[in-house]
């Protein structure tokens, strides 16, 4: 049951990150114009990973994109790409994880496939995380660079008669959004993680074969051994006897011909 | 049809208040901000301050922070100014005007109203 | 506050004639995010209030006569009456739209022969 909530948790966290990574790809606000003193004023600047916006006192507000690939910043590009490869790799990860839900019964899948299908997902849902964590902070490093050069030069003139003041742009929304909806991916990742562990079937009955020992008229079965699945942290065989109680989240199996001597 | 109606003109003593209204019609008065602007012979055109109806939001030059208040009532579709402490300085036309859309311009004017302060 | 100074503060031309008055800003008016300068071009008649010409430094408000032709960016500014008529004998002011408070120039004041 903890499994199971675990499993669901963390999809649904993913969930959660992944739409607040998608919005934060598509905001507009990633860099806004920094207002320092005043709070007010009449032309304000904004920017996203797309383009850029202007929004006046009378509250018009005019977008335009950035039609140019080749003149944009290598760090913008990087960003995009660094968003993107989140989105995809998240997107992945929600369709595999489905799936993966322990709720969901596909056909006659196989509790170690939906560990391993849980496990691939929480992988995905961490490297998306990851990678909008690292998007945004290229970003946020990017905008705390210039922010100081166009502090260092903030009124740029001729002979001092003539003053051009530097527009400065500080963190927008879009980013505080997007710390968020990485760290939110990331903690969904690692909850598909742990929910995988205990998907991991403890035991796993192999088949008996009756085995005649020289000289005894007793028949020896071997005993089922803890499948491997390499997150096991018991290295110990446990024998495995008919009869014994299953849980849940163990691997059915069926009687068959060699199961009785 | 825009159109910004200012009440009649005002001859008051030094020292007290006056309140002048501008009437807006011929749009939705509280999509847009009204503007006021006040006009001397000595000083030419000084921009006061304007007020965003829609939002009740308004913002003032430092100069008339003290000087004006703005409000506005939706209902009526009127914007009113309010001018404390007159003083000599304070005689002139005061003039409401229609934020433009674009550009951060004045697009329509009210005919203005003149104030006159007397000792 | 951003200061617009305006030349000449009169000037006196016939009918027909080609006008240029000039408007400078303390500051630049160019706004980086759209490449847009924030000055607006205003024309007085005696007895009235003032009318919208120009925003943005050269788009011409609906309904004003193509020969007002707005121009200049940055600080420098430019208003040009190409064929100036009797009816624009009047005060012409420019606007810092750019930052609060918005600022007026004095005025240049365009007189008819």
């Known amino acids: 049951m903890a499994v199971t909530a675990c499993q669901g948790l963390g999809f649904v966290v993913s969930l959660i990150g992944i739409a607040g990574i998608i919005a934060a790809t598509c905001m507009d606000q990633w860099s806004t114009q920094d207002l320092y003193n005043n709070p007010v004023t009449a032309v304000f600047n904004y920017q996203g990973l797309w383009r850029s916006c202007v929004r006046e006192s009378s509250g018009f507000t005019e977008c335009r994109g950035y039609f140019t690939l080749l003149g944009l910043p290598a760090m913008l590009q990087a960003v995009r790409a660094l968003m993107i490869v989140g989105i995809v790799l998240g997107a992945i990860g929600l369709l595999v994880s489905i799936f993966a839900l322990k709720c969901i019964r596909i056909g006659s899948m196989e509790d170690s496939a939906k560990a391993n299908m849980t496990l691939t997902s929480g992988i995905m849902f961490i490297v998306s995380g990851l990678c909008a964590i690292a998007g945004v902070s290229v970003f946020a490093n990017m905008l705390v660079t210039n922010f100081w050069m166009s502090t260092a030069n903030m009124y740029t003139g001729m002979g001092g008669m003539v003053q051009t003041v530097q527009t400065r742009y500080t963190f927008g929304a879009a980013l505080f959004v997007g710390w968020v909806a990485g760290g939110l991916t990331l903690i969904g990742g690692v909850m598909m993680c742990i929910a995988c562990r205990g998907l991991a079937p403890e035991e796993t009955n192999y088949k008996a074969v009756s085995y005649h020992a020289s000289g005894h008229s007793v028949a020896y079965k071997p005993g089922g051994f803890k499948a491997s699945t390499g997150f096991g942290s018991n290295t110990k065989n446990k024998k495995i006897y008919d009869g014994g109680a299953r849980t849940e989240d163990e691997v059915q199996s069926y009687p068959s011909k060699h199961d009785y001597v | 049809q825009t159109y910004l109606q200012q009440s009649g003109a005002e001859l008051v003593r030094s020292g007290a208040s006056v309140k002048m209204s501008c009437k807006a019609s011929g749009y939705t008065f509280a999509s847009y901000n009204i503007h006021w602007v006040k006009q001397t012979p000595g000083q030419g055109l000084e921009w006061i301050g304007y007020?965003?109806?829609?939002?009740?939001?308004?913002h003032y030059n430092q100069k008339f922070r003290d000087k004006a208040t703005l409000t506005a009532d939706t209902s009526s579709s009127t914007a009113y100014m309010q001018i404390s402490s007159l003083t000599s300085e304070d005689s002139a036309v005061y003039f409401c005007?229609?934020?433009?859309?674009?550009?951060?311009?004045?697009?329509?004017w009210g005919q203005g109203t003149l104030v006159t302060v007397s000792a | 506050d951003i200061v617009m100074s305006q030349s000449p503060s009169s000037l006196t031309v016939t009918t027909g004639e080609k006008v240029t008055m000039t408007c400078k800003s303390s500051q630049s008016l160019l706004n980086s995010g759209n490449l847009k300068n924030y000055l607006a071009w205003y024309q007085q008649k005696p007895g009235q209030p003032p009318k919208l010409l120009i925003y943005?430094?050269?788009i011409r408000e609906s309904g004003v006569p193509d020969r007002f032709t707005g121009s200049g960016s940055g600080t420098d500014f430019t208003l040009t009456i190409i064929s100036v008529q009797a009816e624009d004998l009047a005060i012409y002011y420019c606007q810092n739209a750019y930052t609060f408070p918005f600022t007026l120039g004095g005025g240049t004041k365009l007189e008819i022969k």
């Open positions: 943005w430094a050269s």
């Open positions: 007020i965003y109806p829609g939002k009740d939001g308004s």
């Open positions: 005007a229609r934020g433009g859309y674009y550009g951060n311009s004045f697009d329509y």
